[in-house]
Interface confidence: low
Amino acid sequence: GITIPRNPGCPNSEDKNFPRTVMVNLNIHNRNTNTNPKRSSDYYNRSTSPWNLHRNEDPERYPSVIWEAKCRHLGCINADGNVDYHMNSVPIQQEILVLRREPPHCPNSFRLEKILVSVGCTCVTPIVHHVA
Amino acid sequence: GITIPRNPGCPNSEDKNFPRTVMVNLNIHNRNTNTNPKRSSDYYNRSTSPWNLHRNEDPERYPSVIWEAKCRHLGCINADGNVDYHMNSVPIQQEILVLRREPPHCPNSFRLEKILVSVGCTCVTPIVHHVA
């Protein structure tokens, strides 16, 4: 890969745990100012595979609140507004990074953690297993 | 809210930037070991609103590689396998946390950043604006 020269203004890294323990500034920078405003959307209600959003709260985690999508139906909504069980509503999942307080209840010490969240649902054609 | 007593074994937090600057252990703990293996799925291909996955790489970010979904069609795939433009394929977006090297190129100093990623696509009924 490309070798990027180290910035001489970097904080000291002579810690015996380096590079596993790093300094992180929690003043969040938001890169989303010019992104599509449709993210503030009602897709969860208008989708053919609609979902509900459930609040998952954990004070030992940062962010402490995460939203989990749960598909409303096994099937998908057809043009008549009925559930069509020939299709399947399935969750779209994503692994995200969160910070976990470690040791517990510490305000300024965290460990990086990967968790799997369901972001929404999509309608898929089911896999049909043919029996020989 | 509940006041959680501070753990006496916490690292020292007398830093003038506290609590904005914290220590983070980058040894990732993965909570997903027993989760549904379907997340490595072919939903992107089987969905009625299929999508392609694009690699987004940035060496100044952690994680450096993020996958972005782009919907293949404006419409959705109907039962005949054709694109139905009476419905819309739309991206399901999620704001996630990443670590951005700050100052740039520093191996052990980061700032928390929010970015918006498209995780997959779902099929929605379009909003029809009636003209009076």
């Epitope: 989303n32 100012t33 405003p37 503030s40 969860y44 209600n45 509900n52 995460i66 939203w67 969240v117 | -």
Partner: antibody, heavy 124, light 107 residues
Framework: EVQLVESGGGLVQPGGSLRLSCAAS????????MAWVRQAPGKGLEWVAT???????YYRDSVKGRFTISRDNAKNSLYLQMNSLRAEDTAVYYC??????????????????WGQGTLVTVSS | DIQLTQSPSSLSASVGDRVTITCRAD??????MHWYQQKPGKAPKLLIY???NSEIGVPDRFSGSGSGTDFRLTISSLQPEDFATYYC?????????FGQGTKVEIK
């Protein structure tokens, strides 16, 4: 912390105009839909208008063509230009913003944060 | 427009009582129903959103339920600070509409 401060209310004669302002702080203003909600003295709440992040606007029927909702993202400000005012427009006008949750794909379509309100009185 | 009808319009109750307020929509609003509390001279305060989710900092004696057209706000054990007017709001379609309000008074 989210803060919304309305200004511009006052006494105006029927047929007159008034421009309300709402100064927002504590959140990325340009990312969010914003709304005006009013409350006539002793009455219930009434949604007036909403403006989306990209400038799309929505109005209740009784104010369409008379009121204009707008925003200045550079100034973190929301406005309501009220023309052809009627006695029935007399109310406390609240500026409202949606939730600031950013975790996940939560839709942000309902008021979660409110200003203190500014009183508009239409009377001769 | 979607009409929301709250009942009762007012009620008298004592501290410790269980109180339920209903909100009926004349067409389905799916899960896009929210509840607010308002005290005299103050701005409304969001209590419950998307039918049953409590806003941060709202006491857990407040809960919401329902779906489609019929929704309920329940206060499991009324406290002195809960005497106020409560409104439901639908954000399913424009124009957004509020219920006419339910005033909860001290018996």
């Amino acid at each position: 912390e989210v803060q919304l401060v309305e200004s511009g209310g006052g006494l105006v004669q029927p047929g007159g105009s008034l421009r309300l302002s709402c100064a927002a702080s504590g959140f990325p203003f340009s990312d969010y839909s914003m709304a005006w909600v009013r409350q006539a003295p002793g009455k219930g709440l009434e949604w007036v208008a909403t403006i989306g992040p990209s400038g799309d606007t929505y109005y209740r029927d009784s104010v369409k063509g008379r009121f204009t909702i707008s925003r200045d993202n550079a100034k973190n400000s929301l406005y309501l230009q009220m023309n052809s005012l009627r006695a029935e427009d007399t109310a406390v006008y609240y500026c409202a913003s949606p939730p600031q949750y950013y975790e996940g794909s939560i839709p942000r379509l309902w008021p979660a944060h409110w200003g203190q309100g500014t009183l508009v009185t239409v009377s001769s | 427009d979607i009409q929301l009808t709250q009942s009762p319009s007012s009620l008298s109750a004592s501290v410790g009582d269980r109180v339920t307020i209903t909100c009926r929509a004349d067409e389905s609003v799916r899960t896009l129903m929210h509840w607010y509390q308002q005290k005299p001279g103050k701005a409304p305060k969001l209590l419950i959103y998307l039918v049953s989710n409590s806003e941060i900092g709202v006491p857990d004696r407040f809960s919401g339920s329902g779906s489609g057209t019929d929704f309920r706000l329940t206060i499991s054990s009324l406290q002195p600070e809960d005497f106020a007017t409560y409104y439901c709001l639908q954000t399913h379609s424009y124009p957004y509409t509020f219920g006419q309000g339910t005033k909860v008074e001290i018996k």
